[in-house]
């Protein structure tokens, strides 16, 4: 498909001249940021961004790649080096420590320097590193965590927790020996390490005692509370704050977000991770965009500003399943949340960053025609005289042999939301990838986001932009419109 | 491997504070660029950049990812959307038209708007678009093309040629009907479309009549001249310029580059593409770094400045073979050329851009330990109880079934320069990938390189920075040190 207007050189020359004009007008703001938002696309490497752009464009009846994601409109871009101290290809724990605390850690640890060792409880104490969210809270800002995963998952946990094992969601997941040594589960740390104003995502079951039925799935024992210590962490959290509210469904969330008496809000909408956007019950569970909007409504009341972490956390899960449909539709919802946040905030006073913790071994090749489905087949056949998809994985559960050969695939099969793209190597879960990821930046001090940087730089840019520790002597003009 | 200094949070905090300091010091230059250099890593997607960084670092006895490529030091980064008008995943012809001429074209066409159709000679005339190199020449600058492929290959051809078929290297490749319609082969266009001061790379055989023995392989008929029109294009080119010199080996190149009487230099060092760096005969063929240096020595004599295109063109070829060793060692030589050019030029007056035309379905996953070989195995085994490499391809010739199953692989096999990484789909040639690629920028007006841009933006930034058509009214201060 060749759009007729694109046949004319004037189309491209005009478009580029406009882009140049916009580039020339870019003026680095010399003010500080009142508000900080970090949007984290878990597993959202550059190949995911491009494929999601095409899909989002095609959902709007465009050919695809010529369209813009919300993140594409951010004026500054850098590349982030995601390796952990011990691994070329990292996990979401070590990376969360990097972009949220400004220090690199080891694989599967969270909020700890690399002096801590995975699963060794006794290496925790003294190696804790403090997140920018924590520093923002200490500076009088309101803070929030929003995610489509459980709120105790690796990425959000980087904002508040310190643990040698990212899998210690509730005390039931922590070995007795580690509990005796004083290592706390992540759910406990969520309510006790610091005062978080807004907590929205999944993860109900880690907050309640074993045997507590889940409100949404009361007959499903596997979805009920998991805690062995008998604690009701939600109750404990509510007791800490006069204006605290706990909600577990969309209706309650929307009500609470508009209630001026609510100062603290915890919304846990699933026992574990939230459902994929394509499986979400829109009457019971809010979308990431809705959670983001609710968080911003509450947080923006603080005249000193806020820090907000927003994670599209299940992009990663879709990729691990080798189900690109899931990964890409999650990316689109993540981008919708970015777009909505942009409408609800001002780039005059809000530094917004979009990045990924790591990438995936996900590729988009095969020379497909413009406008063809991102989930479709490449033109022509492979060496084995069978069709193949444009989307493929290096490794993962999509590897199948049928009668000792690679299976054929049709356009209707490959377009299914359940279809697993093929891979070179059979794994139970497709792996992360180690290449640099993009950082998109907009707002005060966004111009500092440049070049190729360590992932840790992200936390430092945020801290500097808002004059938080260790950059309290930031020498930046107060942000525009401050009321503090 | 955990470096002990990296266990200390101070290591990361200090490093990030230094990076912030450098970011704060960045001052957009308000001057014009006297010189323009575009370094084109053919097929050098972000995954290739990261893997090459690790390899280059490990060759210097470092762990790898913490080190810097020369391109990593460029202060500004953007993402470039590489699709062609007719394909989501492009080729090197359409992309060359974009980044060298500022207009997107169709798959496998070069220097033509999308009104031209692949292989249809009669759609050429009237659809030609003019490269920035051509415009630089018209403005009085010296211009050069350096590549490790044949100089008539798609990427370099974007600087000087207009053709509906990128494969029309010599007239022997052009169908008689197209020749009769007046369509010229690329080699002919190389010497007749414009005056190019420096031409260095491969591609001897397309310049000489059929039956002309090659000077390096005189007994090998397959390496000799291919032209049917009986023309000796080298002779014709030499006749055009008083100070023109033709060389075909490294020794002659080094002599010519130091000879003040040489004003124009053509060096063609192989009949077709130049050899991979790892196979290069270092007495006969120059490296990309040496060719770049030779080009800069000649071009920098012009007080009005120069335009130089430098291509690491065989990164792409290594990937098409699914031989990551070749692709990554080519990337390192490409980066060495960038480094050398940086030493020979000044960022006060030279805008240098580094980018790729497109990516490849190449991934780097599997959670390998820090410091482990980039060509090594992932920890653990796959579902089929066999080892697997951290580097893999989505598709390509590395797909093999042995006795109806995926073959096992050892560390010594995977480390071999000839090893083909496995892929999900068997193809004769691994394909390009469609995700955005990075653009790295340094020098006057480099700050314009920002955000997510169409690939065409690159040509426009170069033209604007040097006040070339259509930006002659660029309103920029003359570049520092101009002698014009």
């Amino acid at each position: 498909i060749i759009p007729v207007e694109e046949e004319n050189p004037d189309f491209w020359n005009r478009q580029a001249a406009e882009a140049l004009g916009a580039a020339k007008k870019l003026q680095p703001a010399q003010t500080a940021a009142k508000n900080l938002i970090i949007f984290l696309g878990d597993g959202m490497g550059v190949s995911t961004v491009t494929a999601a752009r095409i899909l989002k464009g095609q959902k709007k009846d465009k050919l695809g790649p010529e369209t813009f994601l919300a993140m594409d409109r951010f004026p500054y871009v850098a590349l982030s080096k995601t390796y952990s101290v011990d691994k070329h290809v990292p996990d979401s724990g070590a990376t969360a420590t990097a972009y949220l605390c400004g220090v690199k850690g080891n694989f599967q640890t969270i909020g700890l320097s690399a002096a801590a060792r995975f699963n060794q409880c006794n290496t925790t104490r003294g190696n804790e590193v403090i997140s920018v969210m924590n520093r923002a809270k200490k500076a009088g800002k309101s803070v929030g965590v929003v995610t489509t995963t459980r709120v105790q998952h690796a990425s959000p946990a980087g904002a508040y927790a310190h643990t040698v094992n990212r899998n210690w969601y509730s005390d039931a997941d922590v070995p007795a020996s580690a509990r005796q040594e004083g290592c706390q589960d992540i759910a406990t740390q969520l309510i006790s390490n610091m005062d978080i104003d807004v907590i929205l995502g999944g993860g109900r079951k880690y907050m309640f005692p074993m045997g507590t039925p889940d409100p949404e799935y009361p007959d499903d024992y596997s979805q009920g509370g998991t805690r062995l210590d008998g604690k009701n962490l939600v109750q404990e959290w509510l007791a800490k704050h006069q204006g605290a509210r706990y909600v577990w469904n969309r209706t309650e969330l929307l009500q609470a977000s508009l209630d001026p008496s609510v100062t603290h809000l915890m919304g846990l909408f699933e026992p574990g991770d939230m459902k994929y956007e394509i499986h979400r019950d829109s009457t019971l569970d809010p979308s990431l965009m809705e959670m983001t909007e609710a968080a911003l409504l509450l947080l923006s009341r603080n005249p000193r500003g806020f820090f907000l972490f927003v994670e599209g956390g299940r992009i990663d899960h879709g990729h691990h399943e080798s189900r690109a449909y899931r990964a890409l539709t999650e990316t689109i919802m993540f981008d919708d949340a970015i777009e909505r946040a942009g409408q609800l905030t001002s780039e005059e006073d809000t530094l917004s960053l979009v990045t990924a913790d790591h990438s995936h071994v996900f590729s988009f090749g095969g020379y497909p025609l413009r406008g063809s489905s991102i989930f479709g087949l490449a033109p022509g056949k492979a060496r084995d005289r069978k069709a193949y998809t444009v989307l493929l994985y290096g490794n993962g559960p999509g590897y199948v042999l049928k009668d000792g050969a690679r299976p054929d695939v049709t356009e209707s099969e490959s377009g299914s939301p359940e279809y697993r793209q093929q891979s070179a190597v059979p794994l139970d879960g497709e792996t992360h990838a180690g290449e640099d990821v993009a950082v998109f930046a907009r707002g005060p001090q966004a111009h500092l986001v440049h070049g190729v940087q360590e992932q840790t730089f992200i936390a430092h840019v945020m801290a500097f932009a808002a004059c938080l520790e260790p950059y309290t002597a930031c020498d930046l003009a107060p942000r525009a419109g401050t009321t503090d | 491997i955990i470096p002990v200094e990296e266990e200390n949070p101070d290591f990361w905090n200090r490093q990030a504070a230094e990076a912030l300091g450098a970011a704060k010091k960045l001052q957009p230059a308000q001057t014009a660029a006297k010189n323009l250099i575009i370094f084109l890593g053919d097929g050098m997607g972000v995954s290739t950049v990261t893997a090459a960084r690790i390899l280059k670092g490990q060759k210097k006895d470092k762990l790898g990812p913490e080190t810097f490529l020369a391109m990593d030091r460029f202060p500004y980064v953007a993402l470039s959307k590489t699709y062609s008008v007719d394909k989501h995943v492009p080729d090197s012809g359409a992309t060359a038209t974009a980044y060298l001429c500022g207009v997107k074209g169709n798959f496998q066409t070069i220097g033509l708007s999308a009104a031209a159709r692949f292989n249809q000679c009669n759609t050429t005339r009237g659809n030609e678009v003019i490269s920035v190199m051509n415009r630089a020449k018209k403005a009085g600058k010296s211009v050069g093309v350096v590549t490790t492929t044949r100089v008539q290959h798609a990427s370099p051809a974007g600087a000087y040629a207009h053709t509906v078929n990128r494969n029309w290297y010599s007239d022997a490749d052009v169908p008689a009907s197209a020749r009769q319609e007046g369509c010229q082969d690329i080699a002919t266009q190389l010497i007749s479309n414009m005056d190019i001061d420096v031409i260095l790379g491969g591609g001897r055989k397309y310049m000489f009549p059929m039956g002309t023995p090659d000077p390096e392989y005189p007994d090998d008929y397959s390496q000799g001249g291919t032209r049917l029109d009986g023309k000796n294009l080298v002779q014709e080119w030499l006749a055009k310029h008083q100070g023109a010199r033709y060389v075909w080996n490294r020794t002659e190149l080094l002599q010519a580059s130091l000879d003040p009487s040489v004003t124009h230099l053509m060096g063609l060092f192989e009949p077709g593409d130049m050899k991979y760096e790892i196979h290069r005969d270092s007495t006969l063929d120059p490296s990309l770094m040496e060719m770049t240096e030779a080009a800069l020595l000649l071009l920098s004599r012009n007080p009005r400045g120069f335009f130089l295109f430098v291509e690491g063109g065989r990164i792409d070829h290594g990937h098409h073979e699914s031989r990551a060793y070749r692709a990554l060692t080519e990337t390192i030589m490409f980066d060495d050329a960038i480094e050398r050019a940086g030493q020979l030029t000044s960022e006060e007056d030279t805008l240098s851009l580094v980018t790729a035309d497109h990516s490849h379905v190449f991934s780097f996953g599997g959670y390998p330990l820090r410091g482990s070989s980039i060509f090594g195995l992932a920890p653990g085994k796959a579902r089929d109880r066999k080892a697997y490499t951290v580097l893999l391809y989505g598709n390509g010739p590395g797909y093999v079934l042995k006795d109806g199953a995926r073959p096992d692989v050892t560390e010594s096999e995977s480390g071999s320069p000839e090893y083909r990484q496995q892929s999900a789909v068997p193809l004769d040639g691994e394909t390009h990938a469609g995700e955005d690629v990075a653009v790295f920028a340094r020098g006057p007006q480099a700050h314009l390189v920002h955000g997510v841009q169409e690939q065409t933006f690159i040509a426009h930034v170069m033209a604007f920075a040097a006040c070339l058509e259509p930006y002659t009214a660029c309103d920029l201060a003359p570049r520092a040190g101009t002698t014009d």
């Epitope: - | 790892i278 196979h279 005969d281």
Partner: antibody
Framework: EVQLVESGGGLVQPGRSLRLSCTAS????????MSWFRQAPGKGLEWLAL??????????EYSASVKGRFTISRDNSKSILYLQMNSLKTEDTAVYYC??????????????WGQGTLVTVSS | DTQMTQSPSSLSASVGDRVTITCKAS??????IAWFQYKTGKAPKLFIH???TLQPGVPSRFSGSGSGRDYTLTISSLQPEDIATYYC????????FGQGTKLEIK
């Protein structure tokens, strides 16, 4: 002109060792892959060992039949290729050839061969 | 390792005959196949590389073809001087020779 001249062959008892040499001239020795092959009486050609060039760290590869017994090496200062053969067996009796690879179409083509040296393993 | 199966092992033909020798690889070798002529007491002589490229000095009656796993050497019109043993060699993954085809004149 490329020249390869093997030497060091002869009669040797089973279980003993022998070192073959291949003296190269007419090209930049360090830039090329070098290999050893053999042809046993009445048998086919067999590849034995390969040593790569400077750019690839002079890495080595062996066929399963000689791995652990034979060692390929090179003295780049003298442009000599070696094959150290240990624990020789009667079935190692053959004419041994060294060959240089040239990269045409990016494949390691064996364009140049020596004339061979005969090794006889017998008690 | 890649195995090469060459056939026939011997072949008797008359001068002027068209002769075909085949090699089948155990896996795709991406056209990286060479054909050698071997005469007793001489070094093997490279005739064809990369499936079909004739070496300098090799008569044009020799040709090569194939792709994937299957490859062929053809002599269009057999001459007395062609009497020798012919070997295929894959060089995609290290080196592996076929078993050889001994060519004789009837």
């Amino acid at each position: 002109e490329v020249q390869l001249v093997e030497s060091g062959g002869g009669l040797v008892q089973p279980g003993r060792s022998l070192r073959l040499s291949c003296t190269a001239s007419g090209f930049t020795f360090t830039d090329y892959y070098m290999s050893w092959f053999r042809q046993a009486p009445g048998k086919g050609l067999e590849w034995l060992a390969l040593i790569r060039n400077k750019a690839t760290g002079y890495t080595t590869e062996y066929s399963a039949s000689v791995k652990g017994r034979f060692t390929i090496s090179r003295d780049n200062s003298k442009s000599i290729l070696y094959l150290q053969m240990n624990s020789l067996k009667t079935e190692d009796t053959a004419v041994y050839y060294c060959a240089r690879a040239s990269f045409y179409y990016d494949g390691k083509v064996l364009a140049y061969w020596g004339q061979g040296t005969l090794v006889t393993v017998s008690s | 390792d890649t195995q090469m199966t060459q056939s026939p092992s011997s072949l008797s033909a008359s001068v002027g005959d068209r002769v075909t020798i085949t090699c089948k690889a155990s896996q795709d070798i991406n056209k990286y196949i060479a054909w050698f002529q071997y005469k007793t007491g001489k070094a093997p002589k490279l005739f064809i590389h990369y499936t079909s490229t004739l070496q300098p000095g090799v008569p044009s009656r020799f040709s090569g073809s194939g792709s994937g796993r299957d490859y062929t050497l053809t002599i269009s019109s057999l001459q007395p001087e062609d009497i020798a043993t012919y070997y295929c060699l894959q060089y995609d993954n290290l080196y592996t020779f076929g078993q050889g085809t001994k060519l004789e004149i009837k």
